[in-house]
Interface confidence: low
């Protein structure tokens, strides 16, 4: 007896972890036996080379060559989403459509959201080592390592919450070097090593003694960047101080620091950081291009001693450590509009005095660059030729131009076609958006920007054809 198709096994969401192939299953019943057709983001798959999809006789879809596994690039996670697959089973009595299954890639960014810091804790008291793991897909698991070995979490004594390690009762054996390790199927990332010192509790019956302590902050020195921190180190300073007064009643010392405001302005609030030292210590958490005030305060349990004198230090400006964001190209009347958003504040590394915009050679614009002064975040470039326009933008501080954004390209004739044919379609393509199409076309992982530009005319022509086929 004839019957319409029914999906028995729906494709499942899955993570592509390479090197391949990825498989999507679909099984259907029906009489006559239905034929299976697959769609990606609602568009039928051609299955004709060089399409990397292949259909097995049982209806299973193989994705032979998915894009390279996600990785951090210029501090930005690549899209983890390769698309939503659905299968259709059809016979003469009708068509059944499966649930959509999302195929995504594993990604783990380089940068920790919060790095653990050196600290001093007191025996019997609780302390927390903070760690904000890098963004990842799937969400990374966090483990803690101590002195080069994984830390075995003891129920009731250790708690890990959101990546941070809470130690309920400090013991002398907790002293050591701690590291937070984030792991997912894209790999693993290690935080900086944080030194934890554990002190014996000292109950002074006379906190009055603490009030008699005098602290002279003698030196604040900018430290050489740690090569282990990579090409964009954050500044750190070395504080050294002298203590006079009663016999060292202070259990610990805290650095207080703030950015200096203009004369007559209201002072910024003081930030506090427990120091892992008794006469000198390193202090991080600062930003390039700022003027800072520093002082040191002794404490013993809950009792605080008087603050030291204040020392000033100007941290030099550096080039911005991140590119401008959301760079877009839009066609105008005989012009091309470039616009962007400044880099995140923590990456300014000084005062942004303007922006540098480059056009890339080998396109319709000759190689050129423009300087945009001040806070303006757009530029109008006059042009009368159709063709492809590719630009990069970098932020500029007193130290020079920072890293440029990824190239963004606009195909003028295509932008006009789109404006008339597909008003709901998103704006210009970035090379990142094109890369997936180009990899599929050329049956291999993306060959880098230079190669993309070398073969640009062919690639752009084919990528457009491919894009229209998919959308």
């Amino acid at each position: 007896q004839d019957s319409p198709p029914q999906i028995l096994v729906h494709p499942q969401d899955q993570l592509f972890q390479g090197p391949g192939p990825a498989r999507m299953s679909c099984q259907a019943s029906g009489q006559p036996p239905p034929t299976i057709r697959w769609l990606l983001n609602g568009q039928p798959l051609s299955m004709v080379p060089p399409d990397p999809h292949h259909l097995l006789p049982d209806g299973t879809l193989l994705l032979l060559q998915p894009p390279a596994r996600g990785h951090a690039h210029d501090g930005q996670a690549l899209s983890t989403d390769l698309g939503v697959y659905t299968c259709e089973a059809s016979n003469r009595l009708g068509t059944a459509v499966s649930r959509g299954a999302r195929l995504s890639v594993a990604v783990l960014r380089e940068d920790f959201q919060i790095q653990p810091r050196d600290m001093v804790a007191v025996v019997g008291e609780q302390f927390t080592l903070e760690c904000g793991p890098p963004w990842g897909h799937p969400e990374p698991t966090v483990s803690w390592w101590k002195d080069g070995k994984p830390l075995a979490l003891q129920p009731g004594r250790h708690t890990v919450s959101g990546g941070s390690l809470l130690m309920a009762r400090a013991e002398k054996s907790d002293e050591g070097t701690y590291m937070c390790v984030a792991t997912n199927s894209a790999g693993h990332r290690e935080s900086r090593a944080a030194r934890v010192s554990i002190q014996e509790p000292q109950d002074y019956t006379e906190p009055v003694e603490l009030l008699a302590v005098r602290i002279q902050l003698e030196n604040v020195t900018l430290l050489n960047p740690d090569p282990a921190e990579g090409p964009k180190p954050r500044p750190a300073v070395w504080l050294s101080w002298k203590v006079s007064g009663p016999a060292a009643p202070a259990q610990s010392y805290t650095a207080l620091f703030r950015t200096q405001t203009a004369p007559g302005g209201q002072g910024a609030p003081w930030a506090e950081e427990l120091l892992a030292g008794w006469q000198s210590a390193e202090l991080g958490g600062l930003h390039w291009g700022q003027d800072y005030e520093f002082k040191v305060r002794p404490s013993s349990g809950r009792a605080r001693g008087p603050d030291s004198n204040v020392l000033l230090l100007r941290l030099p400006e550096k080039v911005p450590s991140a590119p401008p964001q959301e760079v877009t190209l839009k066609p105008g009347n005989g012009t091309v509009f470039v616009s962007w958003v400044p880099p995140p504040a923590e990456n300014h590394n000084g005062i942004i005095r303007g922006y540098q915009v480059w056009s890339l050679g080998n396109t319709s614009l000759p190689p050129a660059n423009w300087t945009v002064v001040g806070e303006q975040t757009q530029l109008e470039i006059a042009t009368h030729m159709p063709g492809s326009y590719c630009v990069q933008v970098a932020a500029v501080t007193g130290a020079g131009a920072g890293e440029p954004s990824r190239p963004v390209c606009l195909l003028l004739e295509q932008a006009m076609e789109r404006a008339t044919q597909e008003p709901s379609e998103h704006g210009p393509w970035t090379l990142e958006q094109l890369r997936v199409d180009l990899e599929v076309l050329f049956q291999g992982p993306g060959s880098g920007l230079n190669d993309i530009f070398e073969a640009q005319k062919i690639e752009w022509h084919e990528a457009r054809a491919h894009h229209h086929h998919h959308h």
């Epitope: 483990s143 390592w145 994984p150 830390l151 003891q154 054996s173 997912n184």
Partner: antibody, heavy 119, light 115 residues
Framework: QIQLQESGPGLVKPSQSLSLTCSVT?????????WTWIRQFPGNNLEWMGY???????DYNPSLTSRISITRDTSRNQFFLQLESVTTQDTATYYC????????????WGQGTMVTVSS | QPVLTQSPSASASLGASVKLTCTLN???????IGWYQQHRDKPPKYVMF???????SKADGIPDRFSGSSSGADRYLTISNIQAEDEAIYFC?????????????FGSGTHFTVL
Amino acid sequence: QIQLQESGPGLVKPSQSLSLTCSVTGYSISSGSLWTWIRQFPGNNLEWMGYISYAGGIDYNPSLTSRISITRDTSRNQFFLQLESVTTQDTATYYCATPGGYPFHFDYWGQGTMVTVSS
Amino acid sequence: QPVLTQSPSASASLGASVKLTCTLNSQFSTYNIGWYQQHRDKPPKYVMFVKGDGGHSKADGIPDRFSGSSSGADRYLTISNIQAEDEAIYFCGADYNNAGQYGCVFGSGTHFTVL
């Protein structure tokens, strides 16, 4: 893909030392993880012997501490097991293994090498 | 350190279900464990991580027929719709920390036979 391969003599005389090498491909042993030796006795029981971590930290099974040593050569991406004063009780299949995520859950294993202790 | 107890053998029919048990000694009843599958003449293969609260996390490529759960000091590996290739020895393993010494112990293994 991480791959591990054990190598070393299949026959050792009692009271001598047993030396095995684990060669790792697809991942640097100084980049992460715990590089572990596990053995399986003829009755199928598994015994964790010890590890050297990517940072050089070492822990051994307390029952073996007096006669085990695990070392590494990061330039050759290998780590080694040395077991002194062996007896017939050390006859086993020796595996090197490493976890992929959670520290003591071993996702990657070598094929194993059978070592017989006999005179 | 923890002691993990497994029954020596278990069996079930093709297409049926089986629940293998790994029991921790009482002072370690909150510990997480890992399950491993070992076919003849092959190294053990990591199957999943079972937490003290019953949550579990499967290794890549492990079919949905395998699941984990927990009750008190017992950790379970359930195999449903049993296939011939599921015949193997199943081991559980747990890590421990003893005065800063970190290590791992295994259960003695359950020989699982498909009837």
